[in-house]
């Protein structure tokens, strides 16, 4: 019989007690096969996280830095159940730390130098950790002890719980520097005040703080928020302007064997019986013996964290960049104006090597990390591991719902000025072997599909978004008899026919043979009825253009492409004869990298890029034997972007609704941890 | 196409040198990138050092100040002079021209070699 017990491990007498309480109601609810409470009391929170690591308990709620402590090695803890606050039906379950200024004050973030500076209070997350993290680096040295660089940094401050006597600059603001309400500029809405009197210059609050502190918006446009890349948004904009977006307080368990699906059905059940509002005899989110005991007395609800977050993610790339700094205390040498190596992410080993070639090349701007799928790299790219790479319009969504930014689009047309110039897109089409006649668009059900990968735009995104449109479901795996779908779950009627072999088989890498355009068009040469590729795919692998055994004796004519009016085209008639636009593909990275991808790409791309003509005796950025390695190989340049700057303007309004549509269909894990974090 | 066969590993103890050679059978000087990788038991295959036709060079981190890597464009050979050996160096030592492209999983034997004490 599975142990159904949750060891919750408890920091005081109190909690203790509330434990007990916990688990002699929970006996009183849930039947005798349902989960169980016990109790473990240990010291503090740190005890507390290592007897989890230790195994000798389970859960724990924490505060946000206590869950970046947790997720340290050698605790290796992850975030599994997070408390939301206000309503069910807009639970708020992190807040955001920001910068607030004066609407006339004209400084940016990296002007902070020699300003007045308004704080919560010493050591308080929004107030403290995360702004002086995050501006760590550029305090004067020496940083430690870390008062002093501040109080040098800032021409005065208000930094309630500092020490006035060794560091007065710290209390300028507000002599004495006093720890409670009574000083007036103490905490969120005292933070502010200061800034609102005009004692500082910037206030470091968090984003509700504003909204509580000016109930009228003629006044709260009297005030902006700084943002990182140096730019200012209204107060209201915090989602797109903040220094770090910070978890409330999350129940945390063991990476591994950590009994997480277990912890969510315990506290689920918990909230249905003893949540807000539901007994008089024993309440989850209420402390009589003290305050926050086991959970946040304001706490209205838990919300299961998707399970592929961890803690570096859900605490979010500025909130560990901050932590990081202030415990670690390192920076590079000398800060310069100079971009530091740009870390490309390639995805298994073939595209790893050719990342390689191109770092040798590169003369140190380009390094290279790994990655066995295009989630695990926007992942890595999410959390700073990586910094960039090129992906299909599909992932790019992905991508921007986890904060990514484009930079810099593929163009696949030689033109005069190919790098001034994105282009529309290209076409999506459904191809078939011209001998199949009596197929078209209308009688698909039943064939045998092959696709580039799930979640890519030609491959997936439009023909799946269009068949549920007819279907009105997502078991695309009943529609098609089988098919190669690289990323379907392997037990799928969609991984059948692929070809990869042992653990490589539907991997949506090029581990897999029937990955990607060549992939998908090789899946249909040798097993499917039907190929969602790109309109150039098929003139790019017929003709002898591809040497591959399998490719080199193929014929463009016995092709055609499936139209949606349920006739049929040559397949050079792609465009009257397709499914929809397709964005191309774009390099993404984070916003704090776009400057220096942008320009490093362009440095490279003027180096390596179409202009190379002998790619025998040099490296070809844009060359890789038809595999599409780190860049599509019909890329003739890297395009600027001019104002198509974010995920949403970028892929046009038209496929974000598309891929929308199709997001109830979505087997992403990394899209689901991203809207957790982004509704 | 040019084949490439490696040579010069073995034992050593740690703090040890060697230095491994990289012959091919034809002309390497049309040839732009030349590289070593190592892979060792249970381990992804790692690029150790590459080299330019113009003689510009990387190195991994781990290897940085005590590995050296060379060609000599004359004799058709690429060097690595390993010095400052530790055990985590430990490895079959393989080098390639990338000529055969990045989809051929072709390596040749490669060169074991062994850091202990």
């Known amino acids: 019989v599975p142990d159904k017990t949750v060891r919750w491990c408890a920091v005081s007498e109190h909690e203790a007690t509330k434990c007990q309480s916990f688990r002699d109601h929970m006996k009183s609810v849930i039947p005798s096969d349902g989960p169980s409470v016990a109790c473990v009391k240990k010291a503090s929170y740190l005890d507390c996280i290592r007897a989890i690591a230790a195994n000798e308990a389970d859960a724990v709620t924490l505060d946000a830095g206590l869950v970046y402590d947790a997720y340290l090695a050698p605790n290796n803890l992850k975030p599994v159940v997070a408390e939301f606050y206000g309503s069910k039906e807009d639970p708020q379950t992190f807040y955001y730390a920001v910068a607030v200024v004066k609407k006339d004050s004209g400084f940016q973030m990296n002007q902070l130098r020699g300003k007045k500076s308004c704080h919560t209070g010493l050591g308080r997350s929004a107030g403290w950790n995360i702004p002086i993290g995050l501006l760590y680096c550029d305090l004067p040295e020496p940083r430690k002890p870390l008062e002093k660089a501040v109080a040098n940094f800032f021409s005065g401050s208000c930094a309630p719980c500092a020490d006035g006597t060794d560091f007065p600059q710290l209390c300028q603001l507000c002599p004495g520097c006093g720890c409670s309400t009574l000083n007036q500029y103490f905490g969120y809405s005292g933070a502010f005040k200061c800034l609102k009197d005009g004692a500082g210059d910037v206030a470091f609050v968090k984003h509700s703080t504003i909204f509580e502190n000016l109930a009228n918006k003629a006044d709260r446009d009297q005030y902006e928020l700084l943002c990182l890349d140096n730019t200012r948004k209204p107060v209201d904009e915090y989602k797109d302007c903040h220094l770090a977006q910070v978890p409330s307080h999350t129940v945390v368990a063991r990476s591994m064997g950590g009994k997480e699906d277990l912890i969510w059905e315990l506290l689920n059940q918990a909230q249905e019986h003893f949540g807000k509002d539901k007994s008089k005899e024993f309440q989850l989110f209420s402390s009589p013996h003290g305050k926050d005991l086991l959970f946040k007395d304001s706490a209205h609800g838990f919300l299961k964290v998707p399970p592929r977050m961890d803690a570096k993610m859900y605490l979010g790339y500025e909130y560990v960049t901050a932590i990081r700094n202030l415990r670690e205390g390192t920076c590079p040498e000398a800060p310069t104006d100079e971009c530091k190596p740009v870390k490309w992410c390639a995805l298994s080993h073939h595209e790893r090597l050719k990342c390689d070639e191109w770092s040798v090349n590169s003369v140190g701007k380009i390094e290279c990390v790994s990655a066995e799928t295009t989630e695990d790299c926007i992942a890595k790219i999410m959390n700073g591991e990586a910094d960039a790479m090129s992906l299909d319009g599909g992932f790019v969504y992905i991508a921007g719902k986890c904060g990514l930014v484009p930079v810099l689009a593929e163009n696949y047309n030689k033109s005069d000025n190919c790098e001034d110039t994105p282009e529309a897109g290209y076409f999506a089409i459904a191809v078939v072997k011209k001998s199949a006649s009596d197929l078209t668009w209308d009688n698909l059900k039943g064939k045998k599909s092959c696709h580039t990968a799930v979640g890519r735009t030609a491959g997936w995104n439009i023909p799946m978004g269009l068949l549920y449109n007819k279907i009105n479901h997502c078991r695309f795996d009943e529609f098609f008899s089988e098919g190669c779908a690289p990323g379907s779950k392997k037990d799928s009627s969609l991984c059948k026919l692929c070809m990869g072999s042992g653990l490589n088989l539907c991997e949506p890498n090029n581990k897999e043979g029937y990955y990607g355009y060549t992939g998908a068009f090789r899946c249909l040469v040798e097993k499917g009825d039907v190929a969602f590729v790109k309109h150039q795919t098929v003139p790019q692998n017929t003709g002898g253009k591809n040497p591959d055994p399998w490719a080199k004796n193929l014929n463009e004519k016995d092709y055609e492409l499936l139209c949606l009016d349920g006739t049929r085209k040559p397949v050079e008639e792609y465009a009257n004869c397709h499914l929809a636009r397709a964005p191309n593909h774009a390099v993404v990275t984070r916003k704090d990298k776009e400057a220096c991808v942008h320009k490093i790409l362009r440095q490279q791309q003027h180096l390596f890029g179409s202009n190379v003509t002998d790619c025998s005796g040099n490296f070809c950025l844009f060359r890789s034997e038809t595999k599409d390695l780190l860049f599509r190989d019909d890329t003739v340049c890297l395009a600027k972007l001019h104002d198509r700057n974010t995920y949403e303007k970028y892929l046009g309004e038209e496929y974000v609704k598309a891929v929308g549509n199709l997001r109830k269909c979505s087997t992403s894990s990394l899209l689901e941890a991203c809207t957790f974090r982004r509704p | 196409e040019v084949q490439l066969v490696e040579c010069g590993g073995g034992l050593v103890q740690p703090g040890g040198s060697l230095r491994l050679s990289c012959a091919a059978s034809?002309?390497?000087?049309?040839?732009?990138?030349m590289a070593w990788y190592r892979q060792a038991p249970g381990q992804q295959r790692e690029l150790v050092a590459g080299?330019?036709?113009?003689?510009?060079?990387k190195y991994a981190d781990s290897v940085k100040g005590r590995f050296t890597i060379s060609r000599d464009n004359a004799k058709n050979t690429l060097y690595l002079q390993m010095n400052s050996l530790k055990p985590e160096d430990t490895a079959v030592y393989y080098c390639?021209?990338?000529?055969?492209?990045?989809?051929?999983?072709?390596w040749g034997q490669g060169t074991q070699v062994t850091v202990s004490s």
């Open positions: 390639t021209d990338y000529s055969r492209g990045y989809y051929q999983d072709y």
């Open positions: 034809g002309s390497i000087a049309s040839i732009n990138t």
């Open positions: 080299i330019t036709r113009g003689g510009s060079t």
